[in-house]
Interface confidence: low
């Protein structure tokens, strides 16, 4: 029958070529010379040649060697013609299969792979997974198949399998325990793929597993004992720097100190912090020691990792011995700012105050006081005793120097000390009032009408407080009362001003007396111009001759 | 007996192209890898790259890559290199040699007898 | 890129005598070093791969030793067919490199 089964031919065959592989033949060559063609990839067309037909024969040949890897199969198409060319059979379809040879190795995805365990962990851990490939078939053979195996491990410590790799997934597992980053931060295995399932060709690649860190190294004080001087009163002052090991990785987590004051500091004088770069504790004073109190503290710091330990571990702890230096503090004022009533007007060389200072030292220095600060020179202070006297009058309605009723004053007290210590405080002298302005009228100058003419609203001032203010009184003298008239208003703080007779156009003093509350009296003249005029009147109408 | 055989001296212009070979047998050619290696007149080795005629692949020195391409027939198990835009820094011995898996990485067990390349105008 | 040094560059010794070479490599090649031994006008011959394993057919009066990045090949009792040049060459992962060679002359 005009028909072929499939063909298979080994690749890299060594010929020699053209090699037979198989005769096509129709049985109608029994009445006709037959002459034989083949078509297809392979054929006459690319890849052009590889195949051809002996024409007469039918024997099918191969030119050259193949290669599965690159085709591994070709569908050709066999033709039988009579000798005018006419087809005497249907075009038949020849499979040819490319038989696998073990030709390729495997290749691993890279010549190094990276993976990562934690140090510490138990056996059968996974790492990573390792892949190599293999060109050739896997299926019909185990050419392709591809077999892992572990060739090397360095460092060989603790010993020289730590690890395993899964035959067939490439599965890289931990087989051993005793993974200490500590003593090794990273292996090195040469890894083998071998193809035939193990029995053939063998590649290599690296595998490099990075032992990753664990807190399981707790840091630890070198020195443990130390003895610093701080001055006393000092506050953010460094203290120490205390020096801690870990041999956990640096500037991690578990490298990474944490400080703790466990004991030594009732008063919550100390802090400590930690150096992010060389991981000392910083001890540093968050108040101001002082010398007279306690001149000596005993500290016990203790160090532990920002990252908790991942086993019991004894924790180290330091102990600091802190002496504190004795200073010459400063005499201090008490209190700070002090208030003072004091009438204002008081006779020269009063006494105002004692004001005076205490010096925090131990030792009984001697003090002595000065004035600072007294802007107005209404004061002056002893130096001995702290005394302040008036020497000049104290005045409440001095707008200059008096704000809200108070007078401030800065002295100063200065120790005998070597060298010596200055302290200031604050006086401030709560001025009293006293009667001592009388009540003055505003405006002092009016324009009036002398026909139907305006009455003349003035507001009423005294400087003074309540109650040497309103109600007020009014009062015209010196005969002003012949033609004015002068009345304080229900409110009492405000003086009209009436004419009564009629006065020729010309300019006028009015008297006008003016007391408050506490009879204190004011006398004001007020410089009135009247115009010849009907009712309202800013300014005189007309040519005026007036003086 | 493996035997590593490779062609005649060449005498080549400045700025030509050079082709040497290198022919195998008694080993499976296919499934070893062929390494190429250059010595200049009174100078060391340098090793230029190496090929898998199996299927072809190649590693170069960096150094060589632009100058050198390796290229391998499994059919008549011969490899080749070709040697472009030559100077008179090319021209030097130049060696095949085999690389031997022994189950680990690798080295050359054997080797060429070399092929003189001069290049002069 | 790896560097292999090879010292000393030249050496004189005497037949008989025991002569060292060390090569030092740039960083850790692990045990992944040979040796090759070349005489005048001929191509060079394996004698010791993986630092220490002497190659088919190379008498056992030479010897390899060393890892990570310090190695040496040592020969005793000299014998008259053991001057030339000798190369140290890493095999750990391309591109492989050669040691500069020490060339070992008769005194």
């Known amino acids: 029958d005009w028909v072929v089964a499939p063909i298979s031919v080994p690749e890299n065959g060594k010929g020699p070529f053209p090699q037979r592989l198989n005769q096509l033949k129709s049985n109608k060559d029994r009445d006709t010379k037959i002459f034989y063609s083949i078509t297809g990839p392979g054929a006459d067309s690319p890849p052009e040649g590889v195949f051809a037909v002996e024409k007469e024969t039918g024997w099918l040949l191969l030119n050259k060697p193949l290669d599965r890897e690159e085709i591994a199969k070709y569908e050709l198409y066999g033709h039988a013609v009579s000798e005018n060319g006419a087809s005497v059979e249907e075009p038949m379809n020849i499979s040819i299969i490319v038989t696998d040879q073990n030709d390729n190795k495997p290749k691993f995805t890279q010549d190094t792979f990276r993976g990562s365990v934690l140090e510490g962990v138990l056996p059968g851990t996974s790492v990573m997974q390792v892949t190599a490939t293999d060109e050739d078939d896997a299926i019909y053979t185990y050419n392709g198949v591809v077999a892992y195996s572990i060739h090397s491990q360095e460092p060989k410590d603790p010993h020289d399998l730590m690890f395993t790799i899964h035959r067939s997934t490439g599965t890289i597992s931990v087989i051993s325990s005793g993974l200490d980053r500590e003593k090794v931060p990273e292996y090195t295995l040469t890894i083998q793929a071998t193809d035939m399932d193990g029995d053939g060709s063998t590649t290599t690649a690296v595998a490099v597993v990075e032992i990753l860190d664990a807190n399981d190294n707790a840091p630890m004080f070198d020195p443990q004992k130390y003895e610093a001087h701080v001055p006393e009163n000092a506050v953010g002052h460094e203290v120490q720097r205390l020096t801690v090991t870990d041999l956990d990785a640096p500037n991690s987590p578990a490298w990474r100190a944490t400080y703790l004051i466990m004991g030594g500091d009732d008063g919550d004088h100390f802090t400590i912090t930690t150096h992010p770069e060389s991981n000392q504790g910083i001890l540093t004073t968050r108040k101001g020691l002082d010398f007279e109190a306690k001149n000596q503290h005993t500290l016990y710091v203790e160090v532990t990792n920002e990252a908790p330990f991942v086993l019991k571990l004894p924790t180290s702890t330091a102990t600091i011995v802190v002496h504190v230096e004795d200073v010459n503090e400063a005499p201090v004022f008490v209190p700070p700012s002090k208030v003072v009533e004091v009438q204002e007007g008081i006779p020269t060389g009063e006494p105002v105050c004692v004001y005076t200072a205490e010096d925090p030292d131990k030792e009984n220095q001697k003090i002595s006081y000065r004035i600072l600060r007294d802007p107005a020179g209404w004061l002056a202070m002893d130096p001995d005793s702290g005394q302040v006297t008036a020497v000049g009058t104290l005045d409440r309605e001095d707008e200059q120097f008096v704000r809200n009723n108070i007078y401030e004053v800065m002295v100063l007290a200065m120790d005998n000390g070597s060298p010596p210590t200055t302290g200031t405080g604050t006086l401030l002298l709560t001025l009293i009032d006293v009667n001592d302005h009388g009540p003055v009228p505003e405006p002092r100058q009016i324009t009036i009408c002398n026909q139907s003419p305006v009455r003349q609203v003035l507001n009423i001032t005294d400087k003074d407080l309540s109650p040497h203010t309103s109600p007020f009184q009014a009062q015209l003298t010196d005969d002003s009362d012949i033609y004015w008239t002068a009345e304080v208003n229900e409110e009492g703080d405000t003086v009209v001003l009436s004419l009564k007779k009629f006065l020729k156009q010309d300019t006028y003093d009015v008297h006008l007396s003016l007391s408050d509350h506490g009879n204190k009296e004011q006398l004001t003249v007020i410089r009135a111009t009247v115009c010849d005029c009907h009712g309202h009147v800013e300014t005189c109408p007309g040519p005026w001759k007036g003086g | 007996v493996q035997l590593v055989e490779q062609s005649g001296a060449e005498l080549v212009k400045p700025g030509a192209s050079v082709k040497i070979s290198c022919k195998a047998s008694g080993y499976a050619f296919s499934t070893s890898w062929m390494n190429w290696v250059k010595q200049r007149p009174g100078k060391g080795l340098e090793w230029i790259g190496r090929i898998y005629p199996g299927d072809g692949e190649t590693k170069y020195n960096g150094k060589f890559k632009g100058k050198a391409t390796l290229t391998a027939d499994k059919s008549s198990s011969t490899a080749y290199m070709q040697l472009s835009s030559l100077t008179s820094e090319d021209s030097a011995v130049y060696f095949c040699?085999?690389?031997?898996?022994?189950?680990?990485?690798?080295?050359?067990?054997?080797w060429g007898q070399g092929t003189r390349v001069t290049v002069s105008s | 890129e790896l560097m292999m040094t090879q010292t000393p560059a030249s050496l004189s010794a005497s037949v008989g005598e025991t002569v060292t070479f060390t090569c030092r490599a740039s960083?850790?090649?692990?045990?992944?070093l040979a040796w090759y031994q070349q005489k005048q006008g001929k191509s060079p011959q394996l004698l010791v791969y993986?630092?220490?394993t002497l190659a088919e057919g190379v008498p056992s009066r030479f010897s390899g030793s060393g890892s990570g990045t310090q190695f040496s090949l040592k020969i005793n009792s000299l014998q008259p067919e053991d001057f030339g040049s000798y190369y140290c060459?890493?095999?750990?992962?391309?591109?492989?490199?050669f040691g500069g060679g020490t060339k070992l002359e008769i005194k």
């Open positions: 040699a085999r690389q031997r898996d022994y189950g680990a990485l690798y080295a050359l067990d054997y």
């Open positions: 993986n630092a220490k």
């Open positions: 960083e850790n090649i692990y045990s992944y």
């Open positions: 060459q890493h095999h750990y992962v391309p591109p492989y490199t």
